[in-house]
Amino acid sequence: SASSRRRQQSRNRSTQSQDVARVSSASDYNSSELKTACRKHELYVSFQDLGWQDWIIAPKGYAANYCDGECSFPLNAHMNATNHAIVQTLVHLMNPEYVPKPCCAPTKLNAISVLYFDDNSNVILKKYRNMVVRACGCH
Amino acid sequence: SASSRRRQQSRNRSTQSQDVARVSSASDYNSSELKTACRKHELYVSFQDLGWQDWIIAPKGYAANYCDGECSFPLNAHMNATNHAIVQTLVHLMNPEYVPKPCCAPTKLNAISVLYFDDNSNVILKKYRNMVVRACGCH
């Protein structure tokens, strides 16, 4: 029917993926951006550089990584976008002055174990949660 | 001892919270930044504005909200920062050209129920996850 055709067109226009949207699959680098799409970047953090060498015994540093890149339309499958991020992207395109693009943030984080001196100079082995970025997405 | 005093000073300098850091409590507006700190902003999304009115029957729109604001040093308790975000903030201060600040992203998302026409014009009631921002944090 004409109304179901119109619904289909409207749905296609609105671009969606996952539950809320069938976002058209774009390459990892969005052509509309000089900046690359949201992804994980490698970053080694030295505890000496942070000035923590006097209380952290081991390790000397760790691969923390970080997330960076654009969350631009269309959000592809690699971007692990939430439904909210998809909606926000569409609202940003309509209203860029007031609503920002979603941001590129960690979606999976791992722990590391750290051997350190506590305030009383005791040696402690402790697991610190959410220290290493394993994956990034648009949120 | 002198070494434990040095450790204490180094620890205080490094500013931390939660597990990894005792971040000093800052006001919601960071003095080093004019931009307000990471927080939830209200946003009502009209499905008509998105061009979805022909296939979404109800609701006509919803309070989606969004996250925006700075994730600047020092990260306070309101910012729900992960350990990684705290480390990244310190690395950004040392190396702002290469490592960005953490970004302000949803930490709690809610679902909404939507009544819509599917491709075959059947009326479907479906719960869409991660549609509403309930809380924001630095990630």
Partner: antibody, heavy 121, light 111 residues
């Protein structure tokens, strides 16, 4: 009703400075992003820059042609937008408009009448 | 050189239909950003004519309509009237700089 009124235009020598004002009334000024747009005589519209809301830390962005020379500011308590123009060049000669950005689709829904800035020796 | 490209001039007789094109790129119109159209009558400030591709502010006659496809947008004016003689500008955003971009303007002459 919504009104934007620019003032402060005039004749200035190259290298000189000028400060334009835009007085807003009839709406909650602090809730709107506002821009400066200029139009050289007989030419098209050229975007100059914008200033965002307190929420955004009053962040200002500028066109490449004016960056480093022009500064946009706002005083929400006075419902006024400003454009500080330094190191003026002859090519800055134009009518300068302030414009309000509407909140749902980001179009410039209200414009001032404009103020003429002439840079000439 | 404007980021958005418009024809410098178009003309039509009263009652006719004219269209004005606005061509951008993948970093502005093609990136999905809204397109707005402004009318500038001689000696006056610009006025918002079409916003969000195709919506008319109150008071704008339905003779004016807008559309967008790919990296281009267009403004159509039907039933041309003498008072439509003006300059018309398209405007969007450019994501490579997150800045406002205008077309160079089109002078409409009603014959």
């Amino acid at each position: 009703q919504v009104q934007l009124v620019e003032s402060g235009g005039g004749l200035v020598k190259p290298g000189g400075s000028l400060r334009l004002s835009c007085a807003a009334s009839g709406f909650t000024f602090s809730s709107y992003v506002v821009h400066w747009v200029r139009q050289a005589p007989g030419k098209g519209l050229e975007w100059v820059g914008r200033i965002r809301l307190e929420t955004h830390g009053y962040a200002a962005e500028y066109a490449a042609s004016v960056k480093g020379r022009f500064t946009i500011s706002r005083d929400d308590s006075k419902n006024t937008l400003y454009l500080q123009m330094n190191s003026l060049k002859t090519e800055d000669t134009a009518v300068y408009y302030c414009a309000r950005v509407e909140r749902s689709k980001s179009g410039f829904d209200n414009w001032g009448q404009g103020t003429l800035v002439t840079v000439s020796s | 050189q404007s980021v958005l490209t418009q024809p410098p001039s178009v003309s039509g007789a009263p009652g006719q239909r004219v269209t004005i094109s606005c061509t951008g790129s993948s970093s502005n119109i093609g990136a999905g950003y809204s397109v707005h159209w402004y009318q500038q009558l001689p000696g006056t400030a610009p006025k918002l004519l079409i916003y969000g591709q195709s919506e008319r502010p109150s008071g704008v006659p339905d003779r004016f309509s807008g559309s967008k496809s790919g990296t281009s947008a267009s403004l159509a004016i039907t039933g041309l009237q003498a008072e439509d003689e003006a300059d018309y500008y398209c405007q969007s955003w450019d994501s490579s700089q997150t800045l406002v971009v205008f077309g160079g303007g089109t002078k409409l002459t009603v014959l």
